[in-house]
Interface confidence: low
């Protein structure tokens, strides 16, 4: 199997950002859990959330109320999360790490860009 994600996710300031992470597995493979972290170089990594196949979503205190699962229906191989109300400080690199059975662990990175729309008066 392999992880499918986007190299770059672009959202407008204030929008919800979908951080995609989908495990394209062979028949019978399962995703046990998905861990999301922010991994900007030089900043150290910061936990976002842990998505467990049995126990659901646990959000790190730093992101309480800001990380959710996409609305149903949900594919059990989909480890994507929503980052609510994106701000400029959210711009950076994110990593999902996926634990699968029986194939082992996989990881993928993406960059989140947050666009600020300036209003020009004529």
């Amino acid at each position: 199997g392999e992880l499918e994600t986007s190299d770059v996710v672009t959202v407008v300031l204030g929008q919800d950002a979908k951080l995609p992470c989908f495990y394209r597995g062979d028949s019978g493979e399962q995703v046990g859990q998905v861990a999301w972290a922010r991994v900007d170089a030089g900043e150290g990594a910061q936990e976002l959330a842990l998505l467990h196949s049995k126990y659901g979503l646990h959000v790190s205190p730093a992101y309480e109320g800001r990380v959710e699962q996409p609305p149903p229906p949900r594919n059990p191989l989909d480890g994507s999360v929503l980052l609510r109300n994106a701000v400029q400080a959210d711009e950076g690199e994110y990593e999902c790490r996926v634990s699968t059975f029986p194939a082992g662990s996989f990881q993928a990175r993406l960059r989140l860009r947050v666009l600020v729309h300036h209003h020009h008066h004529h």
Epitope: V39, Y55, S105
Partner: antibody
Framework: EVQLVQSGAEVKKPGSSVKVSCKAS????????ISWVRQAPGQGLEWMGG????????NYAQKFQGRVTITADKSTSTAYMELSSLRSEDTAVYYC????????????????????WGQGTLVTVSS | DIQMTQSPSTLSASVGDRVTITCRAS??????LAWYQQKPGKAPKLLIY???SLQSGVPSRFSGSGSGTDFTLTISSLQPEDFATYYC?????????FGGGTKVEIK
């Protein structure tokens, strides 16, 4: 560095219960899975069950189902293992062990690898 | 339950020797395998996780390999402090199970 400190040795009568505690310090208690592993004198290691504090749900080995209860108190960063209906063959050293779901640097470990261990609690069952 | 079978159960070796311990799972466990070292009266210590990843602080003379059902722990040059009992453990499914242990003793 995570430290796990267990309660002291116990001597119990057959048929009674024992409750062993395991207090964690130096890490984020909610981020790891706590398991209990026992070792009878001169024998190997045997997993009894575990709990994930952030989810509050315990998972037990079938062998101990109905006789063991594992709980965790997030407010005090303490895990507990209670074993009932004790018999002589339960005489063993009982260890708590912690494995991260994700560690403080965000680098993910498959849970139930035991990065950290308590010092062990000897439980002797004797009439 | 997944059975973990270690061999040999006892191994006599000298300082400087290359030592290999094997662990076989009764069914495929991908790379969900750890190795521990235990000394008398002490708690086990994690050496290797995910079959081949060296735990932080563990000397590089320890290495792990394998996937599926067959796994190996190698000590490239045995040191005096390495005389101990070694256990493998699978974390593929619960109940988590350990091998019976391999005692590495002085020849």
């Amino acid at each position: 560095e995570v430290q796990l400190v267990q309660s002291g040795a116990e001597v119990k009568k057959p048929g009674s219960s024992v409750k062993v505690s395991c207090k964690a310090s130096g890490g984020t208690f909610s981020s790891y899975a706590i398991s209990w592993v026992r070792q009878a004198p001169g024998q190997g290691l045997e997993w009894m069950g575990g709990i994930i504090p952030i989810f509050g749900t315990a998972n037990y080995a079938q062998k101990f189902q109905g006789r063991v209860t594992i709980t965790a108190d997030k407010s005090t960063s303490t895990a507990y293992m209670e074993l009932s209906s004790l018999r002589s063959e339960d005489t063993a050293v009982y260890y708590c062990a912690a494995g991260y779901y994700y560690d403080s640097s965000g680098y993910y470990h498959q849970p139930y690898y035991f990065d950290y261990w308590g010092q062990g609690t000897l439980v002797t069952v004797s009439s | 339950d997944i059975q973990m079978t270690q061999s040999p159960s006892t191994l006599s070796a000298s300082v400087g020797d290359r030592v290999t311990i094997t662990c076989r799972a009764s069914q495929g466990i991908s790379n969900y395998l750890a190795w521990y070292q235990q000394k008398p009266g002490k708690a086990p210590k994690l050496l290797i996780y995910a079959a081949s990843s060296l735990q932080s602080g563990v000397p590089s003379r320890f290495s792990g390999s394998g996937s599926g059902t067959d796994f190996t722990l190698t000590i490239s040059s045995l040191q005096p402090e390495d005389f101990a009992t070694y256990y493998c453990q699978q974390s593929y499914s619960t109940p988590l199970t350990f091998g019976g242990g391999t005692k590495v003793e002085i020849k």
